[in-house]
């Protein structure tokens, strides 16, 4: 069963001091990661017992394995059902506590009733404040039965439930007619899925014979031990004030477990701690009684004395529950109540015995759950005991269950049952996850879900280059931390697999499925520098750069140009996808802006060092384009251009710029300044005869403006080859006079 305890502090003078604590003794409980177990949950269950709304309750986590609920403001907040959920996966378990109001009309004689399938359960509600009306019994909040108030027997109303079955389990309550449901007596009925002493799917298996009020779990045959007892059969008492499956927890406060109710996984239910009884667990056991709720009687023999926490304390020479066994009778010594081995291992199990006559090797045997008897392979004889060693054949899952060590001598016999848990080594169900990669390292999350049993003690990461036959490299990592695989080859695929281990010999599981993880390219190392830049317009910038000369091939796929506009806090990135490029035209920039410019080489997704930055000021935006540009050939070497001034000028034009290009030519265009801004005509001279030219122009104020439309015109025929175009400008009217 899951090691989960719900404690209720029943010192009820002040509801604000009331608290519920859920404690888990499970490994890794409450850590909250899906792979290693969900957190503990503690809440009030309002589905059956509804209380008036109040301020929300406060939940406080104390480490990973304890959670406490506080913040109760009035007594009615306490009434009802509380539950704690803990454990992971198939072991997820709900522990339930039912709280009754001490001032209720009716009070339960006993809150938790655990019965076997087919038994008769009797719930008894004691009259605390009489009311001469019917009594309504409810099951899980719905009407179940009714009694006339005259039917009370000895001041109690009884509900008899014959031949109970597991579906009868639940919360029962007894309430007077016309009385608040918060004044009900609340009960919890737990019906085991099997008859007395049986467990398993068809109830075919025999329970181990739980001692000290332990209850046999109908699913796994384990004893759920009362608080204060431990061992496979609950045969061992904890020290006073301790609880938990291994007595590992301690009751809070100076008065130990006084005033605390303990609720454990079904089919146990709730009780006071060992040595205490009463509705508020504040009364010590009467002489001769011990254990949880003081339900057990000592009946010590041979001078034994009764301890209310542990039962009979035997004088020298005697042992047994009632000190009924003489130390001359052989006795199994210090046998662990539970052993854990991994599947397919061949463990050695030791069993020690003492007695008079002294046990020898042949008098000690080991019996498996299937009835197979193993004889010891060797024995170590010491003055006070004989220890027999058994070599167990390769374990299979069916070996899980109760084993028994038995010693027989002429003085009598003794046997001790112990639980063997055969655990399946964990196997990852998924491949590890790649978190980040670099050229020579991969960062991997090894945390994966797994089949088989935890806890995970170690995680091994195996890796090697893809399609390689070389040995796997292995790294052992902490299960909860990411791992960095280092000193890898760049741009290489690696096969990566996880292997999980649980504690103990043979705890290594099979390797999980592989996954392919590829390292990044090598980082580019060369640092370019900016050769220069040229403003080609208010929003255009031509940039050129160089790289240092190094031997070998260039490591890079291209260049990244970055322009930082500090005023607006904006970055512009331009990708040049050829590693051979050394120049780029940046367009669509913001006129009149101060940019910081740099360039860096990239390879795959990695960037090399950036060039030292340059600072570039783009001129402000220029005027609109000149209108109605027209070209007219005057001779075999002259063409006249006419235009109209741009509209809506932001200021006086300083000059015009004419662009001349041979149509279909591959060469760079020629720019000619017209320095008299009042002109609306100019003659371009020195052109080649019978040649088709393209013209466009723009005005300049503080910066160059937009281009006009492009016009075409051909010079007249067969003149001599000119040296190159020049211009002469006049007022338009003069040009026409010529």
């Amino acid at each position: 069963a899951v090691d989960l305890t719900l404690l209720a502090n029943l010192r009820l003078t002040d509801p604000q001091r009331f608290f519920l604590t859920c404690v888990s003794g499970e490994a890794g409980a409450g850590r909250g990661s899906d792979a290693w177990g969900p957190p503990l949950l503690l809440e009030k269950d309002d589905r059956i017992v509804r209380t008036p709304p109040g301020p929300p309750l406060r939940l406080a986590r104390n480490g990973s394995h304890q959670v406490t609920l506080r913040g109760f403001s009035k007594p009615s907040d306490l009434v009802g059902v509380f539950s704690c959920v803990g454990g992971a996966g198939a072991r997820r378990t709900r522990v339930i506590y039912v709280h009754n109001s001490p001032g209720a009309h009716l009070l339960p004689d006993k809150v938790t009733h655990t019965v076997n399938k087919g038994d008769t359960a009797v719930l008894s509600a004691r009259v605390h404040k009489e009311k001469q009306t019917d009594v309504i019994w409810k099951s899980n909040g719905s009407y179940f039965y009714t009694l006339d108030w005259h039917e009370a027997q000895d001041g109690r109303f009884l509900l008899q439930l014959p031949n109970v079955q597991p579906p009868s389990s639940g919360i029962y309550s007894a309430t007077y007619l016309e009385a608040s449901p918060l004044g009900s007596a609340f009960f919890r009925l737990i019906v085991r899925g099997c008859g007395a002493g049986r467990w398993g799917p068809g109830c075919t298996k025999e329970c181990p014979g739980c001692l000290h009020g332990g209850v046999c779990h109908d699913h796994d045959g384990e004893c759920v031990c009362p608080p204060g007892f431990t061992g496979t059969r609950c045969e061992q008492a904890c020290r006073e004030g301790r609880f938990g499956q291994s007595c590992q927890e301690q009751c809070p406060g100076i008065s130990g477990c006084r005033g605390l109710t303990f609720c454990l996984p079904d089919p146990y239910g709730c009780s006071c701690g060992s040595g205490w009884r009463g509705s508020q667990c504040q009364e010590a056991c009467a002489p001769g009684h011990f254990g949880a709720d003081c339900r057990l009687q000592c009946q010590c023999q041979n001078g034994g004395t009764c301890d209310r926490f542990s039962g009979c304390v035997c004088p020298s020479g005697w042992h047994g529950v009632h000190c009924e066994k003489s130390d001359r009778i052989p006795q199994i010594l210090n046998m662990a109540s539970e052993l854990e081995f991994n599947l397919e291992t061949m463990p050695r199990i030791n069993c020690a015995a003492a007695g008079n006559p002294f046990p020898v090797r042949g008098s000690i045997e080991l019996r498996k759950p299937d009835g197979t008897v193993l004889l010891s392979t060797k024995a170590i004889v010491e003055p006070e005991k004989t220890t027999a060693e058994f070599e167990v054949p390769r374990l299979v899952l069916a070996d899980s269950g109760f084993w028994e060590c038995r010693v027989s001598t002429s003085g009598g016999q003794d046997s001790r049952r112990f639980k063997v848990n055969v655990k399946v080594p964990p196997v990852p169900l998924a491949a590890p996850r790649l978190l980040t990669k670099q050229s020579r390292q991969l960062v991997v999350s090894p945390l994966v879900s797994f089949s088989g049993d935890g806890p995970i003690s170690t995680v091994r990461l195996h890796y090697r280059p893809q399609d390689s036959t070389m040995d796997w490299s292995t790294i052992v990592v902490d299960p909860s931390e990411n791992v960095t695989l280092m000193n890898l080859r760049p741009k290489t695929g690696y096969s990566v697999r996880v292997q999980l281990s649980r504690p103990g010999e043979g705890g290594e599981g099979a390797w999980g499925p592989p996954t392919l993880m590829t390292t990044d390219c090598p980082e580019p190392l060369l640092q370019p520098w900016l050769e220069g830049w040229h403003v080609e317009g208010t929003d255009r910038l031509r940039v050129s750069w160089s790289l240092p000369l190094v031997p070998g091939p260039l490591v890079g796929d291209g260049f990244l140009l970055r322009l930082w506009d500090g005023t607006r806090g904006q970055e512009r990135r331009e990708n040049v996808s050829s590693p051979q490029a050394r120049t780029a035209l940046l367009t669509g920039l913001t006129p009149g802006t101060h940019y910081q410019l740099d360039v860096q080489l990239y390879h795959c997704t990695l960037l090399g060092p950036a060039s030292p930055p340059a600072h570039v000021l783009l001129p402000p935006s220029g005027p609109p384009a000149p209108r109605h540009l027209h070209a007219q050939a005057l001779s075999d070497s002259e063409i006249q251009l006419t235009w109209k001034h741009p509209e809506a000028l932001p200021g006086p034009i300083s000059k015009y710029v004419v662009e001349v290009q041979v149509a279909g030519g591959a060469g760079d265009p020629l720019w000619i300044d017209v320095d008299r801004p009042e002109e609306t005509s100019t003659i371009i001279r020195g052109l080649n005869a019978s040649t088709r030219y393209l013209f466009r122009m723009r005005a300049s104020i503080q910066g160059l403006g937009d281009w006009s439309n492009t016009v075409e015109e051909s010079t007249l025929g067969n003149g001599l080859q000119a040296e190159g175009p020049v211009q002469e400008s006049r007022a338009a009217e003069e040009g026409l006079d010529q």
Epitope: D134, I136, Y143, T146, D148, W149, E151, S180
Partner: antibody
Framework: EVQLLESGGGLVQPGGSLRLSCAAS????????MSWVRQAPGKGLEWVSG????????TYADSVKGRFTISRDNSKNTLYLQMNSLRAEDTAVYYC????????????????????WGQGTLVTVSS | DIQMTQSPSSLSASVGDGVTITCRAS??????LNWYQQKPGKAPKVLIY???SLQSGVPSRFSGSGSGTDFTLTISSLQPEDFATYYC?????????FGQGTKVEIK
Amino acid sequence: EVQLLESGGGLVQPGGSLRLSCAASGFTFSKYRMSWVRQAPGKGLEWVSGIYPSGGGTTYADSVKGRFTISRDNSKNTLYLQMNSLRAEDTAVYYCARPTYYYDSSGYYYSGPIDYWGQGTLVTVSS
Amino acid sequence: DIQMTQSPSSLSASVGDGVTITCRASQSINNHLNWYQQKPGKAPKVLIYAASSLQSGVPSRFSGSGSGTDFTLTISSLQPEDFATYYCQQSYSTPWTFGQGTKVEIK
């Protein structure tokens, strides 16, 4: 579907006895209170007797106290009314009835109406 | 025992009329009053419980009110199937007692 079927009615002389039965089906008979209600020809309804699920608690109208006995057999899902020292004024249709409880929004339970009735059986007391 | 007095003992009305029947208890019964409808040769059928709560499946033209000793059953608009005898009953204490009945006839 809840069904209540009365039987055992008939003609009986004054001072005589009769035992009425009511066979219940369609609900868990052993969990509910049951009652007998009668109606004299052309007259109103009169509650006669009631019994709790265990059979331990019984109540009677003053007019029948000491003469009539209500009982039940939960294993047979049957309600009985043993009528002794019958009088002419006991002539009536006898209904087997199941009263209910109801609860309010706060969860308080109250004794409610008779929500299921049989079809009735006629008892005639006459010489 | 608690006496229940119903009035009127009979009334004539037409389809569509509104009808009110009253019931008085000889002592306070809080709201533990139920109303039944009975047609000739049939068993009674519960209409209203707890003085004003409409039983499931009963048309909303039926309504109840009152508390303590005085209670009322109202049929807001009589339908042909509503012509029957109506009884009040207290479930406050045993013996449970019924009113003598009110017969609603067609005018």
